[in-house]
């Protein structure tokens, strides 16, 4: 099967989410850590991560088929201090599997606003910190 | 366990300078901007100057830039405050403080370095 | 730059007593943060977020509010709550802005 990861971002309000979701099967869950950065280009690792999630096998889903596992990274107010090129990474201690995600960023802007760019999934989000609107 | 170490206030002449310095330890110090906040004795708290985690960019209170430098050296866990002429209105107990990375809290502060400016 | 404008500046309370501090802000802010001070010793965050206790906080204390007006609450005064609290935004571009403190004594 394919494991892949992906990165994502969504706002409620003032806040800004961000996503790393990896798609595995379900019994490779097991010893999976998936971790996010900033700005570190060479050394990102679960000990150097901003935040970081052990993955676990849930005896609860059923089947064989694909499943995805997230970590969710929540800034409740996006400030200068953010801006910042991030990664999502994941590993897995039992088969030395290693996921890098595509770098994205965090720009603040000087009129107070922010944008997030580098997603896949979608490629350019520009968020108004005032309004908190998604354009 | 996270700890914060200011070092290098003390009694300062008005027109000097001074460089205050805190030292990390505890938790990755590279990952995580960094502030310092002044308390005038008797007085409130106020914000003085944050610096980013990597070091690059710098942000100050208005009634301070042109005087004040923050920096900092992540090979070391060590932050710094460069304060040149030096005024009375700045004595005042200095806290490093680090930012909350999900918040717009300051979640630790260290025990404050006292600056004292008198002649 | 906006300004945090607490109130009261210095107040007393007996054991058991619910108190409520408020802080006002001159334009509306998206969150209040606040903090307790003792003599001698650093700023601790109390409440962050309006109404998240900071770790080891006791549940008699509570915050609340929103725009303009933001609040922190001890439901059962206690001696130790005797402390000066500060209240904290943060808004572009004026960065991060504290309120002048409240001094609570206990009577």
């Known amino acids: 099967g394919c494991i892949n990861i992906t990165s994502s971002a969504s706002q409620e309000g003032t806040r800004l989410n961000l996503i790393c979701t990896v798609w595995h099967k379900k019994e490779e869950a097991e010893g999976f850590v998936v971790f996010l950065c900033k700005d570190r280009s060479g050394d990102c690792s679960p000990e150097t991560s901003l935040k970081q999630l052990r993955l676990k096998r849930d005896p609860g889903i059923d089947g064989v088929g694909e499943i995805s596992s997230q970590l969710m990274f929540t800034i409740s107010q996006v400030t200068p201090l953010h801006s910042g090129t991030y990664q999502c990474c994941a590993r897995s201690q039992k088969s030395g599997i290693r996921l890098q995600g595509h770098f994205f960023s965090i720009l603040f802007t000087e009129t107070g606003n922010y944008t997030v760019t580098g997603l896949k999934q979608r490629q350019h989000l520009e968020f108004s910190h005032n309004e908190g609107t998604l354009s | 366990e996270v700890k914060l170490v200011e070092s290098g206030g003390g009694l300062v002449q008005p027109g000097r300078s001074l460089k205050l310095s805190c030292a990390a330890s505890g938790f990755i110090f590279s990952n995580y901007a960094m502030a310092w906040v002044r308390q005038a004795p008797t007085k409130g708290l106020e914000w003085v100057a944050s610096?980013?985690?990597?070091?690059?960019?710098?942000y100050y209170r208005d009634s301070v830039k042109g005087r004040f430098t923050i920096s900092r050296d992540n090979a070391k866990n060590t932050q710094y405050l460069h304060i040149d002429s030096l005024r009375s209105e700045d004595t005042a107990t200095y806290y490093c403080?680090?930012?909350?990375?999900?918040?717009?809290?300051?979640?630790?502060w260290g025990q404050g370095a006292m600056v004292t400016v008198s002649s | 730059e906006i300004v945090l404008t607490q109130s009261p500046t210095t107040m007393t309370a007996s054991p058991g007593e619910k108190v409520t501090i408020t802080c006002r802000a001159s334009?509306?802010?998206?969150?209040m943060h606040w903090y307790q001070q003792k003599p001698g010793a650093s700023p601790k965050p109390w409440i962050y977020e309006t109404s998240k206790l900071a770790s080891g906080v006791p549940d008699r204390f509570s915050g609340s509010g929103s725009g303009t007006s933001y609040s922190l609450t001890i439901n059962n005064m206690e001696a130790e709550d005797a402390a000066t609290y500060y209240c904290?935004?943060?808004?572009?571009?004026?960065?991060?802005?504290f309120g002048a403190g409240t001094k609570l004594e206990l009577k």
């Open positions: 904290q935004q943060w808004n572009y571009p004026s960065m991060y802005t």
């Open positions: 610096v980013n985690s990597g070091g690059a960019n710098t």
């Open positions: 334009s509306s802010v998206s969150y």
């Open positions: 403080a680090t930012h909350n990375y999900e918040s717009t809290v300051f979640d630790y």
